[in-house]
């Protein structure tokens, strides 16, 4: 009755700010009737807490049950097969879902020009689950950095980069005209956690935007 | 600017094998997976498989398990599928495509960066 089935190979989190998913991949040869039961532990309390019976999907967004996630030791998640009466044993995540293991994404960029400066605002992200005192640059209230990547249109695709401690940033175009396209990856200098470039924001430059001084 | 480049598509018989190839370029790459999708002619794109970075996992379609075997390269830059005993039903335009949102593998939703498309036709 207990464990006939197998367990599934492979259990983790892909997790952005209040947005925290959970993945696994599907037993060998599973049915129709297959499903998947998820638990959740929270260090410090030590007992599992089940928060779905039957999922028939193969990953499970647990950001409303791990709100408190940036002020908790963290958790661990397991998941087991289920089909009809037959369970197969847990397969646990192998490291402890902490705020460590959170991926740093930006909220959008915005790029203006000015006197032949391209200013850059990084906007955070604002993610609708996070409680209203969860704020990014709360959470993350030193060291905030960001890596920026300009390239120019058309070009030879080199990149220049450049590291700014402020969600505001300017970028000297040297005089040159044309399309700058600018991605940017956040960091937080005091911590390991791992960041995600954003998509590529454009902007045109053309003469108008140059103020001729004598 | 990233770039996904496909390569290996191809006419080939029914029961041959082919090998589909993905680059991804550029020094601002970033993903939590890389996969592959398809679209026959009047059909929706669909899943083929994937493979998540974190999890070290892949992810088939029921349509191609066991015939179809998706590796990767240490960068976490390159996949390749390798398709065995392939069918008439998987002729379809094969695309890349690069997992930039934590939600589910089989969602093309999920994935920001797409290749251009490579043609692979099997004959009976």
């Known amino acids: 009755h207990g464990t006939e089935l197998p367990s599934p190979p492979s259990v983790w989190f892909e997790a952005e700010f209040f947005h925290h998913i959970l993945h696994w991949t599907p037993i060998p040869n599973q049915s129709e009737s297959t499903c998947y039961e998820v638990a959740l532990l929270r260090y410090g309390i030590e007992s599992w807490n089940s928060i779905s019976n039957c999922s028939q999907t193969l990953s499970y967004d647990l950001t409303a049950v791990t709100l408190d996630l940036y002020h908790s030791n963290g958790y661990r998640a397991r998941v087991r097969a289920v089909d009809g009466s037959r369970h197969s044993n847990w397969t646990v995540t192998n490291t402890r879902f902490s705020v460590d293991e959170v991926t740093l994404t930006v909220g959008s960029v915005n790029l203006e020009i000015h006197n032949g400066f391209i200013l850059g605002k990084i906007q955070l992200p604002r993610p609708k689950m996070a409680p209203a005192n969860d704020t990014y640059e709360s959470i993350f209230s030193h060291f905030r950095e960001y890596e920026i990547a300009i390239r120019k249109v058309p070009g030879n695709f080199t990149f220049t980069h450049k590291k700014v401690k402020h969600e505001n940033f300017s970028l000297l175009t040297s005089g040159e005209v044309g399309e700058f396209c600018v991605q940017v990856k956040p960091s937080v200098a005091s911590r390991s956690n791992k960041g995600m470039w954003s998509k590529e924001e454009c902007i045109s430059l053309t003469r108008q935007y140059f103020t001729v001084t004598n | 600017q990233v770039q996904l480049q496909e390569s290996g598509g191809g006419l080939v018989q029914a029961g041959g094998s082919l090998r589909l190839s993905c680059a991804a370029s550029?020094?601002?790459?970033?993903?939590?997976?890389m996969g592959w999708f398809r679209q026959a002619p009047g059909k929706e794109r669909e899943f083929v498989a994937a493979?998540?970075?974190?999890?070290?996992?892949?992810y088939y379609a029921d349509s191609v398990k066991g015939r179809f075997t998706l590796s990767s390269d240490n960068a976490k830059n390159r996949i390749a599928l390798q398709m065995n005993s392939l069918k008439p039903e998987d002729t379809a335009v094969y695309y890349c495509?690069?997992?930039?949102?934590?939600?589910?593998?089989?969602?093309?939703?999920?994935?920001?960066?797409w290749g251009q498309g490579t043609q692979v036709t099997v004959s009976s």
């Open positions: 493979i998540s970075w974190i999890g070290g996992s892949t």
């Open positions: 495509a690069a997992k930039y949102y934590t939600d589910s593998y089989f969602a093309a939703t999920s994935y920001a960066y």
């Open positions: 550029g020094r601002t790459f970033s993903s939590y997976g």
